[in-house]
Interface confidence: medium
Amino acid sequence: FKIETTPESRYLAQIGDSVSLTCSTTGCESPFFSWRTQIDSPLNGKVTNEGTTSTLTMNPVSFGNEHSYLCTATCESRKLEKGIQVEIYSFPKDPEIHLSGPLEAGKPITVKCSVADVYPFDRLEIDLLKGDHLMKSQEFLEDADRKSLETKSLEVTFTPVIEDIGKVLVCRAKLHIDEMDSVPTVRQAVKELQ
């Protein structure tokens, strides 16, 4: 007999979402299903069995659900197992740009770009651009093994010149979570210098 999971191997979910993992068999009329995490922590979900299909539902998903979930199907004396890695993220808001004061040519000003409620923040990269010019790029690699929503900021101090007035500041935040375009992994804020 065969075992299949939906999704096949990886589920990327935003914190607060409802997640359903499905395990099904072919070539076995009455399988016995069981679910566990790879490190045997609590499932934190509800299992529903119907014929040749078993579904594990976790609602809402949070840090405690970030595991590899293993579905085991037993058919008579034969056992098959398949895993689905559940990864969670949070990237709900566009960045915000704040200036330390009014813009004056020749007077240093600090630009702060903040991204709130991010997870996992070790995969966050923030770029601050003035027009087409990249002023600063920053990653947040430290303390990655911390399960929390955090605000991450980038700061740049520069001295504006007359030509800067009318230019735009762009804060672009990218959360490197998926190669596919299934989630909004890039967010940006724009502020005109005036």
Epitope: E125, S137, L141, E142, A144
Partner: antibody
Framework: QMQLVESGGGLVQPGGSLRLSCAAS????????VSWVRQAPGKGLEWVSR????????YYADSVKGRFTISRDNSKSTLYLQMNSLRAEDTAVYYC??????????????WGQGTLVTVSS | QLVLTQPPSVSAAPGQKVTISCSGS????????VSWYQHLPGTAPKLLIY???KRPSGIPDRFSGSKSGTSATLGIAGLQTGDDADYYC???????????FGTGAKVTVL
């Protein structure tokens, strides 16, 4: 299929320079921060340098700071390591390594075959 | 930058279980994810464990990882002759802004 192929190694005199390349294929190169890792003869693994996906952030081991420069060309899916003021202790097999996740400082699940750099007079 | 300490060598008979420790500090193991690698001479290192305790696909469940405070442990159960290799822990160090590997442990299957 995912592949990393290093090149550019060879014999160089102390004080000399060398540029290593790592050609990537089979994945979206620009999405990953990538690293150089080396192993000197009879020694353990030593992380050398890392560059973010955009190329905007770079990191170096203290032992190479000021002498080595990491860079990337995402249009060519290629990672580089410019090595200047080379010393005998830089003799090692140099690997480029890609993390398991798209960004971050996570574990390296994909490695090249390595290129040998020998610094000797 | 050798800030992660491992025992130089560990040995056991086939079928036995061995554990390899990796000791660090709050700036590395304490607050960052730990990975474990197997390295055979002349080959590229192979990732065994990531995020403290997760196995990449294709890695048998004989290999396990755990973390407690500023230390991490790799377990290898049902030891096989093919497990004869060097094993390294690795993590990011927030103080150094650098990735750090352990000193390495040689596993010998007797």
């Amino acid at each position: 299929q995912m592949q990393l192929v290093e090149s550019g190694g060879g014999l160089v005199q102390p004080g000399g320079s060398l540029r290593l390349s790592c050609a990537a294929s089979g994945f979206t190169f620009s999405s990953y921060g990538v690293s150089w890792v080396r192993q000197a003869p009879g020694k353990g693994l030593e992380w050398v340098s890392r560059i973010s996906g955009s190329g905007g952030s770079t990191y170096y081991a203290d032992s190479v700071k000021g002498r080595f420069t990491i860079s990337r060309d995402n249009s060519k899916s290629t990672l580089y390591l410019q090595m200047n003021s080379l010393r005998a202790e830089d003799t090692a097999v140099y690997y480029c390594a890609r993390p398991i996740f798209y960004g971050g400082n996570s574990a390296f699940d994909s490695w090249g075959q390595g290129t040998l750099v020998t610094v000797s007079s | 930058q050798l800030v992660l300490t491992q025992p130089p060598s560990v040995s056991a008979a086939p079928g036995q279980k061995v554990t390899i420790s990796c000791s660090g500090s709050s700036s590395n193991i304490g607050n960052n994810f730990v990975s474990w690698y197997q390295h055979l001479p002349g080959t590229a290192p192979k990732l065994l464990i990531y995020d403290n305790n997760k196995r990449p696909s294709g890695i048998p469940d004989r290999f396990s990882g755990s973390k407690s405070g500023t230390s991490a442990t790799l377990g290898i159960a049902g030891l096989q002759t093919g497990d004869d290799a060097d094993y390294y822990c690795g993590t990011w160090d927030s103080s150094l802004s650098a990735y750090v590997f352990g000193t390495g442990a040689k596993v010998t299957v007797l």
